[in-house]
Interface confidence: low
């Protein structure tokens, strides 16, 4: 089940052992997957926070993590708590981890279970996270992970070179093997030079590349953003001026559950990822994506709840020069702001149209069954399927999505609620923009 | 007091099948995740089987196909099915479950049962 509000630091759930015992096993990706630098920086910090560990006190934890005095309760096994556990922070307790969302393999003392990875783009699942096992994740096919980079997984060759054979397929965890014909030796697997290449596919580390393709490519890309540049400038900068105007940059999800370092900064939404990409295309500074709100914002007025009742059914002509964004009211982080709201939704959604709505939003039949087998109760099915959204999506799961996809259901009488109640629960309020006044 | 009882174990010859119960009494609201662990003499407490409230279940790969785990959430007891038992098999069983009580909000205690002996010999 969902242990809501609980946003301590994953970090914090290692502590001093009591004695030696089993490692907790991180990942259960097949072959090796992590850096060996960082394999330095997490050791330092792993004896910091053993070092620390003492300072963490009861302010550290949510409430809902605070373990009430309580008689004859079950102790640990000597200090240490079963695979799918973890330790309670008075050490007098097994708290079980959430099926789907962290686990822990071993006998452990940890503070907090381990978050489950979540297989990256490019990668396939071949089993999912459970208590006690982390998820195991696998290069997809005609790609493999090789262990000078274990961080991605890289496009197989489609050939060997010159004078080599093929003696090896291209796996998940290797790229194809070829040999000398003469001698039978390996190839060392660097990229040939490119006369020796056979066969490539365009676009693999082998592929050809002469002078005049790059002046073509070059061309081409001028063309590209020449056009990209006018376009924005003509049919698209009404959409993104709001963002730019003062929309809080997307962050966010659960804190002890979104892994930050897989997001990209200022994802709220496509189209402003779009345009960020045509109009800034080499690497971006995080502090140059995040959209930052000025402080006297020209042209758009912050409305209370109560002013913008009547704004709620605005005539079309209004809605195609303005786009009103519903933002937190007390600047706070849009997702997490949106997931206080969830245990609502249920009220305010019809029970018929919960799955497809989810669906929608991106969550896979399985997520959808995890959710009900984890839900407290019937009530409670909406609200852990909302959670899955977002753990899954992080960044991306903002309230103009959800309201999008209810529209598209056509539940136009759903979002009309739950529009109105974040409104009148004073956690959202409109950011209202004027395209027209605010481009001059 | 929350109470976890098995029973259901016994002396079995190999290839024979056993059914373990475990029923939790005493006060509580909700229970999560039940599953049974086995400790043979000498050796850690192994997880064999897990089971949500919604019936997702997970094995250890040494029971695949041959224990099945089940629970009736109306009696609040879960049941071990074990067939085509094997000397390697004998342990002692504890039934765990992971109870949530009001004291606790979300967080869930982790009780044990006192162990029911499980001996697969010819």
């Known amino acids: 089940m969902e242990q809501r509000g609980q946003n301590a630091p994953a970090a914090s759930g290692a502590r001093k052992r009591h004695g030696p015992g089993p490692r907790e096993a991180r990942g259960a990706r097949p072959g090796p997957r992590v850096p060996k630098t960082l394999v330095l920086v997490v050791a330092a910090v792993l004896l910091l926070v053993s070092a620390e560990s003492a300072l963490i006190t009861q302010q550290d934890l949510a409430p809902q993590q605070r373990a009430a005095p309580q008689q004859k309760r079950s102790s640990p096994s000597e200090g240490l708590c079963p695979p799918g556990h973890h330790i309670s922070e008075d050490g007098r307790d097994c708290i079980s981890c959430k099926y789907g969302q962290d686990y822990s393999t071993h006998w452990n003392d940890l503070l907090f279970c381990l978050r489950c990875t979540r297989c990256d783009s490019g990668e396939v699942e071949l089993s999912p996270c459970t208590t006690t096992r982390n998820t195991v994740c696998q290069c997809e096919e005609g790609t493999f992970r090789e262990e000078d980079s274990p961080e991605m997984c890289r496009k197989c060759r489609t050939g060997c070179p010159r004078g080599m054979v093929k003696v090896g397929d291209c796996t998940p965890w290797s790229d194809i093997e070829c040999v000398h014909k003469e001698s039978g030796t390996k190839h060392s697997g660097e990229v040939p030079a490119v006369e020796e290449t056979v066969t490539s596919s365009p676009g693999t580390p082998a592929s050809p590349c002469s002078l005049s393709g790059i002046i073509i490519g070059v061309t081409v890309a001028a063309v590209v953003l020449i056009v990209a540049v006018f376009v924005c400038k003509s049919l698209l900068w009404k959409k993104v001026l709001p963002y730019l105007k003062g929309i809080c940059s997307g962050g966010g999800g659960d804190p002890e559950r979104v892994d930050r370092s897989s997001q990209r900064p200022g994802a709220e939404d496509n189209v402003l990822n779009e345009i960020v990409s045509i109009l800034q295309p080499t690497q971006v500074p995080e502090q140059e994506m995040e959209v930052q709100e000025p402080a006297e914002p020209t042209g758009v007025n912050m409305l209370s709840p109560g002013e913008s009742e009547h704004l709620l059914e605005p005539a079309e002509a209004e809605r195609s020069q303005r786009r009103r964004l519903l933002v937190p009211a007390n600047e706070g982080d849009p997702t997490e702001t949106l997931r206080q709201c969830f245990d609502d939704f249920a009220d305010l959604v019809p029970f018929d149209s919960w799955e497809p709505l989810m669906r929608k939003l991106g969550l896979m039949d399985n997520e959808i069954k995890v959710a009900k087998a984890e839900a407290a109760g019937h009530r409670d099915t909406l609200y852990t399927m909302l959670i899955k959204w977002v753990n899954k999506t992080g960044r991306d799961a903002s309230v103009h999505t959800l309201l999008d996809a209810l529209e598209t259901l056509g539940e136009r009488l759903a979002k009309q609620k739950i529009e109105d109640h974040l409104l009148s629960s004073g956690k959202f309020m409109y950011l209202e923009g004027n395209a027209d006044s605010a481009m001059s | 007091e929350v109470q976890l009882l098995e029973s259901g174990g016994g002396l079995v010859q190999p290839g024979g099948s056993l059914r373990l119960s475990c029923a939790a009494s005493g006060t509580f609201d909700k229970i999560n995740n039940m599953g049974w662990y086995r400790q043979a003499p000498g050796k850690q407490r192994d997880l064999v089987a897990q089971?949500?409230?919604?019936?997702?279940?997970d094995y250890a790969d040494s029971v695949k196909g041959r224990f099945t785990i089940s629970r009736d959430n109306s009696k609040n007891t879960l049941y071990l099915q074990m067939n085509s038992l094997r000397p390697e098999d004998t342990a002692v069983y504890y039934c765990?479950?992971?109870?949530?009580?009001?004291?606790?909000?979300?967080?869930?205690?982790?009780?044990w049962g006192q162990g029911t002996l499980v001996t697969v010999s010819s």
């Open positions: 089971i949500t409230p919604g019936g997702i279940t």
């Open positions: 765990n479950a992971e109870i949530l009580k009001r004291a606790y909000i979300d967080v869930y205690v982790n009780y």
